[in-house]
């Protein structure tokens, strides 16, 4: 099975300057060691062995190797040098590699398990003879690392000085190309078929390719408006119809078919228009309504679907009352008209202002544009009435209206009337045709950068920082509201304040820490931690003060009280030739005067007895909530999702490679980021429409109401539909327009806009 | 040598359950998908159903949603198909096939195909 | 579901011929299209995949081009062992459907 990720191990270098073996014998084996005359140059043939395995805070050697192994061939003599990792040995080991030649020095494990961030490496340097499988008397050298390490492609420095030979290798753990995560269990490959059509982001989410959705991306996206309850779509921007619908989006019911004067609010219907009937709504049921047969003034009777009668008033008859009889004996002449028999009916004679064949036409007494003054002309029943503009009055506007009456001015002492207009007195501060206008005062009294604010008839002057009065010709104490934080000294100035920052600390407001262990103050090899606006030394046993540069007494209050001494008796008068122990397993002990002693510590051990090891995470070393492991003089830092370094000081980029979508601006956080998308688009990576509606989303003058993820036109009067694309235009009922063609209808008429490949009045 | 290699196949009566095996060797089976396609006599291809082994995802045709699982076992580079409530028109010749898939290129194919074993739903 | 048909249903040729069998599908699917060929009572076999590219091992008589829903297989110059059945295959969108195949027979 294919690996999630692989631990890479490049050695560079390996220097084992005596040619010895971890035993003190020379490499070749004849017996010689270096404190019998030396080793012989390049007699080691030196191959690496590596052991991953689980994190152990107390490295064994023996064991297996859990996490994986391997080896290299043999790579030099007593000591080598090979390309570091990193851009230069890349380059160095990509042309050996152009060169037929494999990597030496380089050991990859893979893994087949999520992988648990924390690990120990063993690296054993052997002697090659190929004469005997390896065995400990051909070991070199063995050293080892506890740690952790998160999946990236940089490379981690590690060097080692045994008891023998000196290691330089460098480290990383990566994961395979379609696994993701801190610890690479996370799967994910590109791919657009009908698994999914998607790529993988730099988190090994599914990022959809355009046109899909879904957590899978399998959901083609169809085209905008297509109302999914009728309609949907295996492709993108397709409307594909259910049964019984229709139309562009599919929000057209279909009519039961040879539906003539009727709709459908569902599929297969057919409702009929007001005056139409039967069950495909053809029969006209209002025939006197739509055709008005009668004529002369003969009452229209509806019978049967498509039928009628007239009933003909006095003087005539016929089917359609056309006959003449005694045509004045009715009284057809309207409006005071008079009638008068003529050989084809009657003739009216109209009074003023009637005109027509029965006096029932207003005469439009406007046609003469009698009103003055740009007056409006109402036309009525032998009449007209003049609406007049603002300034004038009179059956015809012609008089002058005196426009005082209305009080038009507001800030004056007085309105006098004119010809056609009027005029305002104003007070001081105010101007315009209605005194309305504040008069802008503000004409730079206002001093040291100061804003000015216009009031009425007056102003007043908004002042920088560090002034005022009312021209901002005063200065002010800037150092008054104590701005200055981690005690800082306030310095007032002509254009605002200086803080003078305590040692520790930086910033306009000595607000930043600064990092007083760069360079470090600390003397003899102590360890610096840096603190809030301090630093703090961590002094090794025989030094104190601040900075660890005062020597301590190393016997306070006189000699060492004599516990035992380095040796013990052998026999009386013997010589002291046996090792107490006394300094345990981390120390050396010195025999001193009278029969005194004393202690050298390993590194990362105290006391007295040299049995206590130094507790490294005492300062609290690892930032941002990371948790520190002490181990023999130094410490580990295990980090929190989205921080690292040795000290969990540094917060990875997470906007490499920039996850924004539609130009997106990203902004790193603690494990995350943050897209400010450009206008119109929203989501975590900015790849969703902001707004769903445009200038084209409803036809027809639609109005486009935005809700979430879909939209609602408001279509104006003679339009429905989801986009207002269908007309209820009787013209369009039923769909003249065949082949997928959309009907658009204007009163009587109708016009055809064809798909793709059709064409004609009706589509054909 | 690639090699697919179903098995389990055989007569079973409406109703009834079946668990066909694909076995897989010569690749590596987390890189590829792998299909169980059908052909009932006289009668052409017709995909059953498929899955991922890396991430378990899986697909089914409509004809058997609800009645057939596939699985996988990475360990053993076998991909399994459970077939319940097993009907007459069940009966074909089942297929398993692999299919690779790149981000490069659409409609890659099924490359290796199994010999096919027989299912029967008959009473 | 995307149907795809296949015409003709079957066909007779020569040795030597020209042939050419079409396949339809009933909505765009780009070109994830597959071809193969199945001789009685042994499994199919890939020909052409991604619509135009020809599988390794393939003899180089055969061709395949078209996206969008109109595809093409052709064999350049029929030998006896062409004669098969032949399917189309979409691998667009779910379910992949196959065409119900073209018969190759000996005329």
């Known amino acids: 099975a294919r690996p999630m990720g692989y631990f890479e191990l490049q050695l560079s270098a390996l220097r084992n300057v005596n040619g010895e073996l971890l035993s003190g014998a020379c490499c070749d084996g004849d017996g010689r060691t270096t404190r019998a005359g030396g080793c012989g140059h390049d007699e080691c043939d030196t191959y690496v062995r590596v052991c991953l395995k689980e994190y152990q805070a107390k490295v064994t050697p023996t064991g297996p190797c859990s996490y994986g192994h391997g080896a290299t061939p043999v790579l030099g003599g007593n000591s080598f040098y090979l390309p570091p990792a990193g851009a230069a040995g890349d380059r160095a080991r990509a042309r050996a590699r152009a060169g037929g030649d494999q990597d030496p020095g380089l050991v990859v494990i893979p893994f087949q398990f999520a992988w648990p961030r924390s690990f120990t490496l063993i690296v054993e340097a052997w002697d090659w003879d190929n004469d005997t499988t390896p065995n400990e008397e051909l070991l070199i050298e063995r050293v080892s690392h506890a740690g952790m390490i998160n999946p990236e492609d940089r490379w981690k420095s590690l060097h080692f000085s045994g008891h023998v030979a000196h290691l330089e290798l460098q480290i990383r753990v990566r994961c395979d190309e379609n696994y993701y995560s801190a610890t690479c269990n996370k799967f994910c490959r590109p791919r657009n078929d009908f698994f999914g059509h998607y790529t993988c982001d730099q988190y090994g989410n599914k990022a959809c390719m355009d046109g899909w959705m879904g957590k899978e991306c399998k959901e083609a996206v169809c085209k905008q408006g297509c109302n999914l309850l009728h309609g949907g779509c295996t492709v993108p921007g397709e409307c594909r119809c259910s049964y019984g619908w229709q139309g562009r989006f599919c929000d057209e019911c279909v009519p039961y078919p040879g539906c003539v004067h009727g709709s459908c609010v569902e599929p297969w219907q057919c409702n009929c228009e007001t005056n139409w009937g039967g069950l495909l709504c053809d029969k006209d049921l209002n025939y006197c309504g739509s055709h008005h047969p009668c004529t002369n003034g003969g009452t229209c009777i509806n019978a049967e679907p498509d039928q009628y009668r007239c009933t003909c008033p006095d003087g005539y008859s016929g089917r359609n009352c056309e006959k003449a009889e005694h045509a004045c004996t009715s009284n057809p002449c309207a409006n005071g008209g008079s009638c008068h028999e003529v050989p084809s009916g009657f003739e009216c004679h109209c009074p003023s202002g009637w005109s027509g064949p029965t006096c029932a036409l207003d005469i439009d007494e406007c046609a003469s544009n009698p009103c003055a003054a740009g007056g409006t002309c109402v036309d009525q029943v032998d009449g007209f009435e003049c609406i007049c503009p603002e300034q004038w009055v009179g059956a015809t506007c012609q008089l002058d209206a005196n426009e005082c009456e209305g009080k038009p001015c507001l800030n004056a002492f007085s309105c006098k009337n004119l010809i056609g207009g009027y005029y305002c007195d104003c007070i001081p501060g105010w101007k315009g045709i209605n005194c309305h206008i504040n008069v802008n005062d503000c004409r730079g009294q206002c001093q040291h950068g100061g804003t000015c604010k216009d009031l009425v008839n007056g102003y007043q002057c908004v002042c920088p920082r560090g002034f005022g009065g009312r021209h901002c010709e005063l200065e002010r104490d800037e150092c008054a509201s104590s701005p200055c934080h981690s005690g800082g000294l306030c310095e007032d100035l002509a254009d605002g304040f200086h803080c003078h920052c305590p040692q520790g600390f930086s910033g306009p407001l000595c607000e930043v820490d600064v990092d007083l262990c760069e360079p470090s103050p600390c003397r003899n090899g102590a360890r610096c931690y840096n603190l809030e606006g301090d630093y703090y030394c961590a002094c090794p046993d025989d030094f104190g003060g601040k900075n660890c540069s005062v020597p301590r007494e190393p016997c306070p209050g006189g000699a060492c009280r004599v516990i035992d001494g380095c040796g013990s008796d052998a026999g009386p008068g013997m010589p002291g030739t046996a090792a107490s122990g006394v300094c345990g397993p981390h120390g050396r002990c010195v025999s001193q005067p009278g029969g005194n002693f004393s202690c050298i510590c390993d590194s990362g051990f105290t006391g007295t007895y040299c049995h206590e090891n130094i507790d490294d995470c005492l300062g609290q070393p690892c930032r941002n909530g990371g948790t520190c492991i002490d181990e023999v003089d130094a410490f580990r830092c295990f980090c929190p999702s989205g921080w690292e370094g040795e000290l969990c000081d540094t917060n990875p980029n997470d906007c490499l490679p920039d996850p924004c979508h539609s130009r997106g601006r990203c902004y790193d956080l603690v494990n995350d980021f943050y897209c400010a998308c450009d206008d119109g688009w929203k989501g975590k990576t900015c790849h969703s429409r902001e707004f769903q509606c445009d200038a084209y989303t409803c036809s027809n003058g639609g109005t486009c109401y935005d809700s979430g993820d879909t939209f609602r036109c408001a279509c104006p009067p003679g339009w429905k539909g989801s986009t207002c694309a269908v007309a209820k235009n009787s013209s369009c009922l039923p769909n003249p327009c065949v082949n997928g063609g959309t009907c658009v209808g204007s009163g009587a008429s109708f016009s055809c806009i064809c798909r793709d490949g059709w064409e004609g009045r009706t589509c054909t | 040598e690639v090699q697919l290699v179903e098995s389990g196949g055989g007569l079973v009566q409406p109703g009834g359950s079946l668990r066909l095996s694909c076995a897989a060797s010569?690749?590596?089976?987390?890189?590829?998908?792998i299909h169980w396609v059908r052909q009932a006599p006289g009668k052409g291809l017709e995909w059953v159903g498929g899955?991922?082994?890396?991430?378990?995802?899986?697909d089914y045709a409509n004809s058997v949603k609800g009645r057939f699982t596939i699985s996988a076992d990475t360990s053993k580079n076998t991909a399994y198909l459970q077939m319940n409530s097993l009907r007459a028109e069940d009966t074909a010749v089942y297929y398993c096939?692999?299919?690779?898939?790149?981000?490069?290129?659409?409609?890659?194919?099924?490359?290796?195909w199994g010999q096919g074993t027989l299912v029967t739903v008959s009473s | 579901d995307i149907q795809m048909t296949q015409s003709p249903s079957s066909l007779s040729a020569s040795v030597g011929d020209r042939v050419t069998i079409t396949c339809r599908a009933s909505?765009?699917?780009?070109?994830?299209v597959a071809w193969y060929q199945q001789k009685p009572g042994k499994a199919p076999k890939l020909l052409i995949y991604?619509?135009?590219f020809l599988y390794s091992g393939v003899p180089s008589r055969f061709s395949g081009s078209g996206s969008g829903t109109d595809f093409t297989l052709t064999i350049s110059s029929l030998q006896p062992e062409d004669f098969a059945t032949y399917y189309c295959?979409?691998?667009?969108?779910?379910?992949?459907?196959f065409g119900q195949g073209t018969k190759v027979e000996i005329k």
């Open positions: 899955i991922s082994p890396a991430d378990g995802d899986t």
């Open positions: 909505q765009d699917v780009s070109t994830a």
């Open positions: 295959q979409q691998s667009w969108t779910a379910p992949p459907t």
């Open positions: 010569g690749f590596t089976f987390t890189s590829y998908d």
């Open positions: 096939a692999r299919n690779d898939y790149d981000v490069r290129s659409v409609g890659s194919g099924m490359d290796y």
């Open positions: 991604s619509a135009s």
